[in-house]
């Protein structure tokens, strides 16, 4: 297993609809054709595998398990979007990238993106 640098933004604020997007960029030492991306959430004394996708370079990312994530890839960048976030989902979201094929296997883990989620205030009742 060889190490690889992964960069991601330090902080992202989710939209009022509970959507947060960030870029995960990895310094690929070679020409990988198969890449696996996993997003981990670290907070509240728990670690959650939020979503994971394996993709062939140049193809769409396919997330399994009714995933709350969507994403696209462009070169050594992965554009990730996490949906359906609630205030209690605030935490550090870590991007983990694995170059699966061809060998050698490379692993890179980012420092994490702190995603802040604020639940929207309910609309006040209207008399009209």
């Amino acid at each position: 297993c060889k190490a690889m640098h992964v960069a991601q933004p330090a902080v992202v604020l989710a939209s009022s609809r509970g959507i947060a997007s960030f870029v995960c960029e990895y310094a690929s030492p070679g020409k990988a054709t198969e890449v696996r991306v996993t997003v981990l959430r670290q907070a509240d004394s728990q670690v959650t595998e939020v979503c994971a996708a394996t993709y062939m370079m140049g193809n769409e990312l396919t997330f399994l398990d009714d995933s709350i994530c969507t994403g696209t890839s462009s070169g050594n960048q992965v554009n990730l979007t996490i949906q359906g976030l609630r205030a209690m989902d605030t935490g550090l979201y870590i991007c983990k990238v694995e170059l699966m094929y061809p060998p050698p296997y490379y692993l890179g883990i980012g420092n994490g993106t702190q995603i802040y989620v604020i639940d929207p205030e309910p609309c006040p009742d209207s008399d009209f």
Partner: nanobody, 126 residues
Framework: EVQLVESGGQLVQAGGSLRLSCAAT????????LGWFRQAPGKEREFVAA????????AYADSVKGRFTISRDNAKNTVYLQMNNLKPEDTAVYYC???????????????????WGQGTQVTVSS
Amino acid sequence: EVQLVESGGQLVQAGGSLRLSCAATGHTYNTYPLGWFRQAPGKEREFVAAISPSGTLRAYADSVKGRFTISRDNAKNTVYLQMNNLKPEDTAVYYCARHRSVGWRASHHLSDYDNWGQGTQVTVSS
């Protein structure tokens, strides 16, 4: 309505291993995340681990990560909790629960889960 029945709890020495099972009945079992929680005497019920509908994604409490492994067999409608290197502080009643919503979540909290089992007692002696 989904019913959950836990089994496998017993008295074990510190450093030992146990495997808990949670058998589910109900046709919606495969579409929901399932979780394990525990409650020690005089303490609140706390999150231990959770697993996504197909079993590809997992979540763990920091206190058990690296020691416990959650898995599920959808053909058998069963979720498992493999517990290794048990410690006296792991002593508790362990409960299986079904997530309220279909699909996976970024975090796991007591309020997210319903359809609780009756629990199985795990006692770790030093």
